[in-house]
Every structure is written in C-alpha cells, then in structure tokens.
Interface confidence: medium
C-alpha cells in the first residue's frame, strides 16, 4: 500500500496577521513529506508547498486572491516512495489518496488578526495635538498594488487612542474610524500615546496589541505654537 | 563548523522579563534546522522551553507557553528568548541549540546535534 | 506529555565494566525522534545517540543505542575514565519535548 506508516497531520493552525497567512501542524515528518492543498468553497483544490518536510505552508499568495472568501485547506502525508518519482502528484503506485487532514474554514476578513499598529507622528499646535497612525501595508493587491489596512477594511477598522500625562496615570482614550485623532491637550503639560486597531464588527480577534507607546518630548512629536 | 553562543544578563530581579539572545556563527540560521533554547535548574535535569523555525514558526512547552516568547532574526543569524514575570523558580542555566532534521535511509531523524555553552541566570532582587 | 524514566538514578560501576542504562516512555514514541546525551559537569550536553540506535558523528563504537515504542537502552560497553557522567534520553516527536530525569554514571 502506497501509505504505509504514514501519520496524518494534525494540530492544523492558521495563523494571520494582516492577511499574512501561514498553515502549521504537527508532527514533524519522518517516514513522509506533506503537501497541501487549498480551494475556495465552490474552487478546484490547488497543491502548494509540494512534498515538503516543513510543518508551515505560506498561503498567503492563495487567499490574498480574495480576502472576503472562505478558503479550505488540507494537508496530505505522502510517504517517501512516492514523492521521489518527481511527479507532482499525490497519489500512490496504486492510485489511492494518502492519508489527509483536514484545516477549519478560513475567511480571511474575518479571521486574520490585526497586526500591532504604529504611531507615525503628532502635532501639537496650541492646545491641541493631531495623532496620526501608520496605515500599513498588506499583501493584498489591487491593480498591482499592495493595499493597505483602512484600504481593505475601510470603515469597519477604527482605531483607539490612549493617552495620559507623563506626570499622571490616569489615561483617557478616544476613537476614530479614519487614522488621524484630534484632541484635547493641557498646554505646557507633556502627554503620552498608545493606539490600538479594532474592528468592532468582529466576534474575535476584534483588537490588536496596543502600539508602543510614544511621549510627547521624544523625536516623533512636531510643536507649534 | 556551526556555533551557538548565549548572551544576555546573568541577575535578573523578581517580576521582570529574561530576556536572552542565542548567535549563530559557521552556518545560516535559514537552513532548515529548529532553534531551541533549554534550561536546567541548579543540580537538576533538563526542560525544554520551546523551539522556533527560521520562519518564525513555534512551539513551547505548555508549561510555559503564557510567558515564553521566542524570536527569531535572519538578518543578524540569531534567535532569542523572553520569558515575563520570572520568579527564583526560573533560576538556571538556559542553553540554546539546533534541533537538526536529518535524511536518512527514506526516512527523517530529529536530535539537537550544536548546544551553546550555556548562560547561568539568577533571578534574586 | 510523554514522560520519560531513567533508571537506575545513579550506577556505580569501575572503569571496564559494561553500563546498561534504561529509558521508559510513558507512551509509545517513535524511535526517530528519540536522542541520548552526555553531560559531564559545568558542559553542554553532548549528543550521543540519534533515532535510538544511530551513533552520532565522532562518538566511540563502545556507545550504543537500542529499543523501540517506549522502552529505550543506552549501554557503554566498556566504561573508559572519561565516561564517568550524567546521561539523558530526549524524545522530540511530541511537545513537549521532554527529558528523562537522567542516569548518573559513577566511578564506584
């Protein structure tokens, strides 16, 4: 039989950060290599990461197609013998199917996590202080162009801003659903700022970790008066 | 021939987080091989904290997992360890290694073949 | 986890003697991903044995490795002054990766 001491993967994980995606699972393989297969729902099945000995497959390239689709994926154990013909196909000398698993959906709108956002700069200008987030860039294209995070999510992204006087601990917050805040500052009083992405819409993964914190007085800031 | 070597600071107070770093010399950490960092407790036997892939994959011990966070830098050939919240139980000496996969007779064998010497930590206020 | 037991803990034996060290699985483990290793005091472990039974490069022939699913055996056949240490038998098919408790080889 063409699937003699194979062992099924298992352990199937997506993990997605700002569509990056990458399927993972167990065990590392010793009589077999594996290749996975991904399809969307009403798709053919497409073979990647052809008779490898790693436990991760970039699929990034595959769901970037399609961000609002729901993507299958399954990982097939293929034993040596037949991964050393040079053919790229899965199955055995008798034709039979190896041994596969099979991941949970994944809809990438719904599931990528979103990154760590980054504060690019603030004003301050009087009493008020103009935050501005970094709109980061993901594999998704369009047009040959690589779009960014508010260009795929528009306005279900909105982020939250953090922020407290360097003397104090007491931290106000306020929201935007564009990447720039505007708020209420004490002139003369040195303040501190930390935003985090959300998508309200979302049952989970619904924030990101908060940014790194940036004070007023450091490199970033711009002062006017 | 491969090298690992382990830097970071020996005393780290209650509380803080560990944090260590593990260079490769005499190969590329791009190779295809695992990067795990093992501890030993004074006097004791040996637990593994967990291993990353140069792509950044990993796995950790579950017992650890909620403080242990492992990283992994191609540009500078080095992986790293942080572990959070230590307390005088994560007093060790805390190694690295390469965790080899090697082909032989159609099949695939795993072992840490290249340890570091090894970095004594002591967590005490 | 998959636990691994060494015994015995400690073996007293005189230079020329034959060792027989043991490692038991708590579940079965597949012998390519089960590792012996010698640590001698203040040194990294070394890697002795790979795929339970493949001496790894450099390592003497008195060195041996055999046993498979969760009974594993580690002899020396004739101990030399310089194997005088602690030994342990890894396993890393399933996380965690584990360590038996180790068996020290001592000169009696």
């Known amino acids: 039989s063409g699937t003699t001491n194979t062992v099924a993967a298992y352990n199937l994980t997506w993990k997605s950060t700002n569509f990056k995606t990458i399927l993972e699972w167990e065990p590392k393989p010793v009589n077999q290599v594996y290749t996975v297969q991904i399809s969307t729902k009403s798709g053919d099945w497409k073979s990647k990461c052809f008779y490898t000995t790693d436990t991760e497959c970039d699929l990034t390239d595959e769901i970037v197609k399609d961000v609002k689709q729901t993507y299958l994926a399954r990982v097939f154990s293929v034993p040596w013998r037949n991964s050393t013909h040079g053919k790229e196909t899965l199955f055995g000398t008798h034709g039979e199917e190896p041994p596969f698993t099979n991941a949970r959906k994944f809809l990438p709108y719904r599931d990528t996590k979103l990154g760590q956002p980054t504060i690019q700069s603030f004003e301050q200008v009087g009493t008020k202080v103009n935050v501005t987030v970094e709109d980061e860039r993901t594999l998704v294209r369009r047009n040959n162009t690589f779009l960014s995070l508010r260009d795929v999510f528009g306005k279900d992204l909105i982020y939250t801003l953090y922020y407290w006087k360097s003397s104090s601990s007491g931290k106000k917050t306020a929201k935007t659903n564009t990447n720039e805040f505007l708020i209420d500052v004490d002139k003369g009083e040195n303040y501190c700022f930390s935003v985090q992405a959300v998508i309200p819409s979302r049952t989970v993964n619904r924030k990101s970790t908060d940014s790194p914190v940036e004070c007023m007085g450091q490199e970033k800031g711009e002062f006017r008066e | 021939q491969v090298q690992l070597q382990e830097s970071g600071p020996g005393l780290v107070k209650p509380s803080q987080t560990l944090s260590l770093t593990c260079t490769v010399s005499g190969g590329s950490i791009s190779s295809g091989q695992y990067w795990s960092w093992i501890r030993q407790h004074p006097g004791k036997g040996l637990e593994w904290i967990g291993e990353i892939y140069y792509s950044g994959s990993t796995r950790y011990n579950p017992s650890l997992k909620s403080r242990v966070t492992i990283s992994v830098d191609t540009s500078k050939n080095q992986f790293s360890l942080k572990l959070s919240s230590v307390t005088a139980a994560d007093t060790a000496v805390y190694y690295c290694a390469r965790d080899t996969p090697y082909y032989y007779d159609g099949g695939y064998y795993y072992y840490m073949d290249v340890w570091g010497k090894g970095t004594t930590v002591t967590v005490s206020s | 986890e998959i636990v691994l037991t060494q015994s015995p803990g400690t073996l007293s034996l005189s230079p020329g003697e034959r060792a027989t060290l043991s490692c038991r699985a708590s579940?079965?483990?597949?012998?390519?991903?089960l590792a012996w290793y010698q640590q001698k005091p203040g040194q990294a472990p070394r890697l002795l044995i790979y795929g339970a039974s493949s001496r790894a490069t450099g390592i003497p022939d008195r060195f041996s490795g055999s046993g498979s699913g969760t009974d594993f055996t580690l002899t020396i056949s004739r101990l030399e002054p310089e194997d005088f240490a602690v030994y342990y038998c890894?396993?890393?098919?399933?996380?965690?990766?584990?360590f038996g408790g180790g068996t020290k080889v001592e000169i009696k």
């Open positions: 579940q079965s483990v597949s012998s390519s991903y």
């Open positions: 890894q396993q890393v098919g399933v996380v965690p990766y584990t």
